[in-house]
């Protein structure tokens, strides 16, 4: 049996930050699990890991330098990403592994979420402030 994962098809990261919710066909309550977010069509870059082990507190880390946090729901993990670059626009895949109790479970590969990172654009001030043109 495989866990099914649902993700938004696309998200826009304004202010270089985004929240990506991974929804699972499995209740993570009282389970030992490892939820992770991967970047790229080949999922080559592990962006963030959220590890749950029965306790109230989730352990969050990134081996690839991404600034992330997480939040656990009964059947979801939301990844919060900060300080994204425009060139980190890509497709991101949620992955879930349940280690305990047996049997070990993981997910069918999801369709992923395209995260479009919008750059910060500064609008130049008009030389002569006045009524704006339509």
């Amino acid at each position: 049996n495989k866990i099914l994962v649902k993700q938004s098809p696309m998200l826009v990261a304004y202010d270089n930050a985004v929240n990506l919710s991974c929804k699972y066909s499995y209740n993570l309550f009282s389970r030992e699990f490892r939820a992770s977010l991967h970047k790229g069509l080949d999922s080559a870059v592990e962006v963030c890991v959220v590890y749950g082990n029965y306790s109230q507190q989730l352990q969050v880390y990134s081996k690839t330098g991404f600034n992330c946090d997480g939040k656990l729901g009964n059947e979801s993990v939301t990844f919060y990403l900060q300080n994204l670059y425009v060139n980190q626009t890509d497709i991101y895949f949620c992955k879930i592994e349940v280690m305990y109790p047996p049997p070990y479970l993981d997910n069918e590969k999801s369709n992923g979420t395209i995260i479009h990172v919008k750059g910060k654009h500064l609008c130049p001030s008009p030389l002569f402030p006045g009524p704006s043109k339509p």
């Epitope: 959220v50 109230q56 507190q57 989730l58 352990q59 969050v60 880390y61 990134s62 330098g65 991404f66 600034n67 992330c68 946090d69 997480g70 939040k71 656990l72 900060q82 300080n83 670059y85």
Partner: antibody, heavy 120, light 107 residues
Framework: EVQLVESGGGLVQPGGSLRLSCAAS????????MHWVRQAPGKGLMWVSR????????SHADSVRGRFTISRDNAKNTLYLQLNGLRAEDTAVYYC?????????????WGQGALVTVSS | EIVLTQSPATLSLSPGERATLSCRAS??????LAWYQQKPGQAPRLLIY???KRATGIPARFSGTGSGTDFTLTISSLEPEDFAVYSC?????????FGQGTKVEIK
């Protein structure tokens, strides 16, 4: 006035344990991420651990993951760091620091520090 | 992780002189860089955040510039209380990292 006061430091043998506390006052403790940052003698600062505002998530530096545990009691306005499996290289002054829950890792107030010495 | 290199290690100056401290990152940290002041036996104090914004209560003689990989902290005219160790810190990438510090001492 924002105040962070660490306690619980001391001399411990290699392999031993210690629990540091940080009592917070002068601000809404439950609204801030809290951190531990350490400074070994004659060395620079090094980030150790963090916990988010409600205590639901935590992160640790690679060098302490699996040995140190950060926790908080928002009812008591207190931050904790449980140090297990201590090594000589963990000898340092340990500071607690607060960070806004939007910037995560920008430390705007620090405590005076607690000295942890690991030696046989 | 991102390595921050500060230079010089020590700066010997007299009160009233201008101090220029450098912090270089091993890769871009955008403008997510802070500067802290630390005196012996005291807690570090946030001076500058986001590369150029002065923290609350910090005198105007402290200023920060730079973005990407090269950053500078300038103290326009040193006061006796400014002799201390100054550290930079990035929060762009995880984990956050600090420079090794620059000591500003009285000449």
């Amino acid at each position: 006035e924002v105040q962070l006061v660490e306690s619980g430091g001391g001399l411990v043998q290699p392999g031993g344990s210690l629990r540091l506390s940080c009592a917070a006052s002068g601000f809404t403790f439950s609204s801030y991420w809290m951190h531990w940052v350490r400074q070994a003698p004659g060395k620079g600062l090094m980030w150790v651990s963090r916990i988010n505002s409600d205590g639901s998530t935590a992160s640790h530096a690679d060098s302490v993951r699996g040995r140190f545990t950060i926790s908080r009691d928002n009812a008591k306005n207190t931050l904790y760091l449980q140090l297990n499996g201590l090594r000589a290289e963990d000898t340092a002054v340990y500071y607690c620091a607060r960070a806004d829950s939007t910037t995560w890792y920008e430390f705007d107030f620090w405590g005076q520090g607690a000295l942890v010495t690991v030696s046989s | 992780e991102i390595v921050l290199t500060q230079s010089p290690a020590t700066l010997s100056l007299s009160p009233g002189e201008r101090a220029t401290l450098s912090c270089r990152a091993s890769q871009s940290v955008s403008s997510y860089l802070a500067w802290y002041q630390q005196k012996p036996g005291q807690a570090p104090r946030l001076l500058i955040y986001d590369a150029s914004k002065r923290a609350t209560g910090i005198p105007a003689r402290f200023s920060g510039t730079g973005s990407g990989t090269d950053f500078t902290l300038t103290i326009s005219s040193l006061e006796p209380e400014d002799f201390a160790v100054y550290s930079c810190q990035q929060r762009h990438n995880w984990p956050p990292t600090f420079g090794q510090g620059t000591k500003v001492e009285i000449k």
